[in-house]
């Protein structure tokens, strides 16, 4: 099908024209411009950048560009009372203190307003006590400690290494274990790739580098004081005691030089196995407390950060659709950074800027997309996806009726090995078809398609000859659109080789060393990977906004639903006796999946044959495609997580970053063998199967012939 038919325009204004207009050199210039000073949410610098982007998007040719502001709860260190951790002796004297700041990178020594490393939303406090090393502080790590090793974390300060799961889950787990403080650190095993030098000589984390980040457990709520509603001028705000997702114990992050000093003295139990050892030259003893000579020494935290209601600013740009202006395709990424944001977020923001420029160029030449494209520069993503969530709360009625798709645009790179895509199954075919048309930027794949290099380097575990596409989890601005509103969503970026680099994220993530130079010297000197990501993100937006029939394939949803049903059934079948005792059956779910598969197949046949020149029928078919994702939304939400409403996907309860399929059933089954009331627990499993089966069946019926 040709996108040109959409708005009856000249053939030169097609996808190729849009892609050809994207330039690596522009992305490079934009990245440089966005990374010279810090743009922390709630600061004047970030407000000024919002106004600059507003002005430039207008110049690029968008129809309108507005600032949308909200007053949300943010968190900052106390400028005169710094946060740190000490080792104290028996007299209470501080004999060792962790560093108060990261040594600035070369060329940035005189930059002001670099926020020191802190855990955003940590409460104030000065707890002191014995240390317990809890590995990654995952659910399974606390199971190992409490159940197998009989180590009690109650009243202890725990030290956990970053990686594997979202830091907020670590803190939640520590709280549930009774800890009175949490120290987070970056172990070189996870943040130092072998054979690579530390910054500024390479892309590895130096010993003084520290990962900042929020430690909330919002579960999709947005601003902690106004869950469900926008934090506008007349908002009713909860008291801090009723705020959503705030941690109850002090938390602070440190680098591995400081961690070495704490961990080298650890006594108590030896680590349970090698998976608990990092790369520092320390025993990785679990504790509690320090070894022999140092047993009278304790650890003390000094946390003085404050939570403050602060104004934030989204930039919302509109390119009105010529044929279906009431159908919205959204491209959004955040603008706020912890410090310079060399990768997160500005490598993404620079790509969005260039995509806007390219669309604007086409518009100035007389072209318009078929559907409206909205461009967003979100604020306060780092503080809990606040800007995007507040805007979506404010515009939820419009979005649920008009939202076709949301494409996320945070960091364009987390490596330079191959493409990484997470998206709704509805977009699988769109992504496959698009990447087949794009050139691979990879060495050794000259003249080959992006699809080919991607498939070779990151093959699908299920389907040979196809690339891996992952489930959407959370930890980024698509969350509200996908998990709460049920708008088809996707994200794409260039990533590392997960086989050879098992560190978590990229080493300099959320540190002061995430600079323009990091990208320009070590990750993407030619900006060819950035350009490829711009082509993927921009190409997806172009097709979603311009194709006559929406580029969604509902048959791909049928395939994954069967896979997810098989998976959850096999998890349940680990308890055959209980399934028999409590009459647990998955028949309804498998039946619903079978129905969905058949109806989706028939819908796809009709989609090939219908009269596309009939605008009413075209709109009807497109609406069925648009509303399919919406049909997976349960208005009541998941148990204890009312803003996670998607029945097929939710962020894992144990790791916000990861997506879980049939999350309601999964959570009901999780650790079911330890539940005190098995009858009640298995009753909840049955209820969740019922909800899932009903939802799949109901979604299938939205694809049936309307009359």
């Amino acid at each position: 099908k040709s996108s040109n038919e959409a708005t009856n325009i000249t053939p030169k204004h097609n996808m190729k024209a849009f892609l050809d207009e994207l330039k690596a050199e522009n992305i490079k210039k934009f990245l440089y411009n966005f990374t010279q000073i810090p743009h922390l949410a709630g600061t004047e610098q970030n407000f000024q950048l919002a106004k600059q982007i507003q002005s430039q998007w207008k110049e690029f040719g968008l129809d309108s560009v507005e600032l949308a502001h909200y007053d949300v709860l943010l968190s900052y260190p106390n400028k005169t009372h710094p946060n740190y951790i000490s080792i104290i002796n028996e007299d209470g004297n501080e004999i060792f203190n962790t560093s108060l700041f990261e040594p600035p990178p070369p060329g940035y020594e005189n930059v002001s307003d670099i926020v020191p490393p802190f855990s955003a939303f940590s409460p104030q406090g000065m707890p002191e006590g014995d240390l317990v090393y809890v590995n990654y502080a995952r659910t399974e790590d606390f199971f190992k400690l409490e159940r197998d090793m009989k180590i009690n974390c109650s009243g202890k300060i725990v030290i956990a290494r970053y990686g594997k799961v979202f830091r907020g889950n670590k803190v939640k787990n520590a709280q549930l274990a009774g800890a009175k403080g949490v120290i987070l650190y970056s172990d070189p095993a996870d943040y130092f790739a072998p054979g690579v030098k530390s910054y500024p000589d390479g892309w590895n984390l130096p010993g003084g580098g520290v990962q900042r980040g929020n430690i909330l457990n919002l579960n999709g709520a947005g601003d902690p004081l106004t869950p469900g509603y926008p934090a506008n001028e007349y908002a009713y705000r909860r008291g801090i005691a009723e705020a959503v997702g705030l941690p109850s114990i002090p938390v602070h992050p440190i680098g591995y030089y400081d961690a070495q000093k704490l961990l080298e003295k650890m006594g108590g139990s030896a680590p349970p196995d090698s998976s608990w050892r990092g790369s520092l030259k320390v025993p990785y003893n679990v504790g509690p407390g320090f070894t022999g000579n140092f047993s009278t020494q304790k650890v003390k935290m000094h946390i003085h950060s404050t939570n403050e209601v602060t104004r934030i600013y989204n930039v919302i740009g509109t390119l009105r659709g010529a044929v279906e202006p009431d159908r919205y395709v959204i491209l959004g990424g955040h603008r706020d950074s912890w410090v310079f944001g060399g990768i997160d977020p500005q490598s993404g923001a620079a790509v969005v800027h260039e995509i806007v420029r390219s669309f604007g160029t086409l518009k100035k030449e007389g072209w318009r997309p078929r559907r409206t494209i909205l461009f967003a520069s979100w604020d306060a993503e780092e503080f809990g996806l606040l800007g995007s969530t507040e805007w979506a709360e404010e515009n939820s009625r419009l979005l649920q009726e008009r939202g076709v798709a949301y494409i996320n645009a945070d960091s364009s790179i987390e490596g330079n090995y191959t493409l990484r895509v997470d998206c709704t199954p509805l977009m699988y075919s769109l992504v496959h078809n698009l990447t087949k048309e794009l050139k691979s930027p990879d060495e050794g794949f000259e003249g080959k398609s992006l699809y080919e290099s991607w498939t070779k380097k990151s093959p699908s575990p299920e389907f040979s000859g196809m690339p891996r596409i992952s489930k959407l989890g959370s930890g980024n601005d698509f969350e509200v659109f996908f998990q709460r509103l049920g708008i088809a969503s996707g994200r794409a970026r260039y990533t590392k080789n997960w086989e050879t680099n098992k560190f978590s994220g990229y080493p300099l993530y959320h540190s002061v060393y995430e600079t323009y130079e990091l990208v320009e010297k070590f990750y993407d000197p030619m900006f060819k990977y950035h350009l490829t990501v711009a082509q993927v993100r921009g190409g997806m937006v172009f097709e979603l906004a311009n194709s006559i029939v929406l580029p969604f394939d509902c048959r791909d949803y049928a395939v994954v639903l069967r896979k997810y049903a098989d998976k959850i059934y096999s998890i349940s079948m680990k308890h055959p006796q209980e399934m028999k005792t409590y009459s647990v059956s998955f028949d309804s779910l498998f039946s619903a999946v079978k129905n969905f598969t058949e109806i989706a197949s028939k819908f796809s046949e009709r989609l090939q044959d219908f009269d596309k020149s009939n605008p009413i029928v075209l709109r009807m078919m497109n609406d069925q495609l648009m509303f399919l994702e919406r049909a997976f939304i349960d208005p009541l939400g998941l148990p204890d997580r009312p803003f996670y409403r998607h029945v097929i996907y939710a962020p894992s309860s144990h790791n916000k970053y990861a997506g879980e399929s049939f999350p309601g059933i999964y959570d009901a089954l999780f650790d079911i063998e330890s539940k005190v009331d098995p009858s009640k627990a298995w009753g909840e499993v049955k209820r969740q199967i019922y909800v899932a089966a009903f939802t799949v069946q109901a979604a299938a019926e939205t694809l049936s012939e309307v009359a």
């Epitope: 080792i87 004999i95 060792f96 203190n97 560093s99 040594p103 070189p188 130092f192 010993g207 003084g208 591995y256 030089y257 070495q260 000093k261 090698s274 050892r277 990092g278 790369s279 520092l280 030259k281 320390v282 025993p283 990785y284 140092f294």
Partner: antibody, heavy 120, light 112 residues
Framework: QVQLVQSGAEVKKPGASVKLSCKAS????????INWVRQTPEQGLEWMGG????????NYNENFKGRVTMTRDTSSSTAYMELSRLRSDDTAVYYC?????????????WGQGTTVTVSS | DVVMTQSPLSLPVTLGEPASISCRSS???????????LHWYQQKPGQSPRLLIY???NRFSGVPDRFSGSGSGTDFTLKISRVEAEDVGVYFC?????????FGQGTKLEIK
């Protein structure tokens, strides 16, 4: 760049004490342990011990315990090593060396050495 | 204490030819985290020792690639692929896995 500058040569009588200094620059002093290594033609290189400038924690070689004391002054980024009850076989070149911490855990930077002569 | 034994103690080499020094420890140098903290130092006449290779096989910054290290457990080797005049000096192996840290007796490399 990292530099360790040691104090000048010393001549001491048996039974006396000697206190050597090692001034560090070009890096964050409290992050890296300072070790002391001596070199004699007879014994070769001998590790005497180390000090953690951050907390002052020391780790001595048993062969020198009771005779060696390592201290530091964080305000001047200087480490000190005092050796008491000197004997003629303590005549040696004494080096301070910075432990490179992760990923090295080796002595990545050495001072120029201080010659100590013990003679009656 | 861990005893480090080097051989040979003296190594005359022709310029441009390879050289190899062996180092054996009295016990395993594998630390509990799986790393082996065996290092090689070079000491040129009248100078302080200088780190050459750390953790068995990793060249320290600025060290030419003609130097390489290998080995595991208790047996280790330093190789120079093509000896140059500036390589003259004494080479020490050392371990920092166990306290106290210990050094080999040194191998004196000289030009034939």
């Amino acid at each position: 760049q990292v530099q360790l500058v040691q104090s000048g040569a010393e001549v001491k009588k048996p039974g006396a004490s000697v206190k050597l200094s090692c001034k560090a620059s070009g890096y964050t002093f409290t992050y890296f342990d300072i070790n002391w290594v001596r070199q004699t033609p007879e014994q070769g290189l001998e590790w005497m011990g180390g000090i953690s400038p951050g907390d002052g924690n020391t780790n001595y070689n048993e062969n020198f315990k009771g005779r060696v004391t390592m201290t530091r002054d964080t305000s001047s980024s200087t480490a000190y090593m005092e050796l008491s009850r000197l004997r003629s076989d303590d005549t040696a070149v004494y080096y301070c060396a910075r432990d490179g911490n992760f990923p090295y855990y080796a002595l990545t930077n050495w001072g120029q050495g201080t010659t100590v002569t013990v003679s009656s | 204490d861990v005893v480090m034994t080097q051989s040979p103690l003296s190594l005359p080499v022709t310029l441009g030819e390879p050289a190899s020094i062996s180092c054996r420890s009295s016990q395993s140098l594998v630390y509990s985290n799986g790393n082996t903290y065996l290092h090689w130092y070079q000491q040129k006449p009248g100078q302080s020792p200088r780190l050459l290779i750390y953790k068995v096989s990793n060249r320290f910054s600025g060290v030419p690639d003609r130097f390489s290290g290998s080995g595991s457990g208790t047996d280790f080797t330093l190789k120079i692929s093509r000896v140059e005049a500036e390589d003259v000096g004494v080479y020490f192996c050392s371990q920092s896995t166990h306290v106290p840290y210990t050094f080999g007796q040194g191998t004196k490399l000289e030009i034939k």
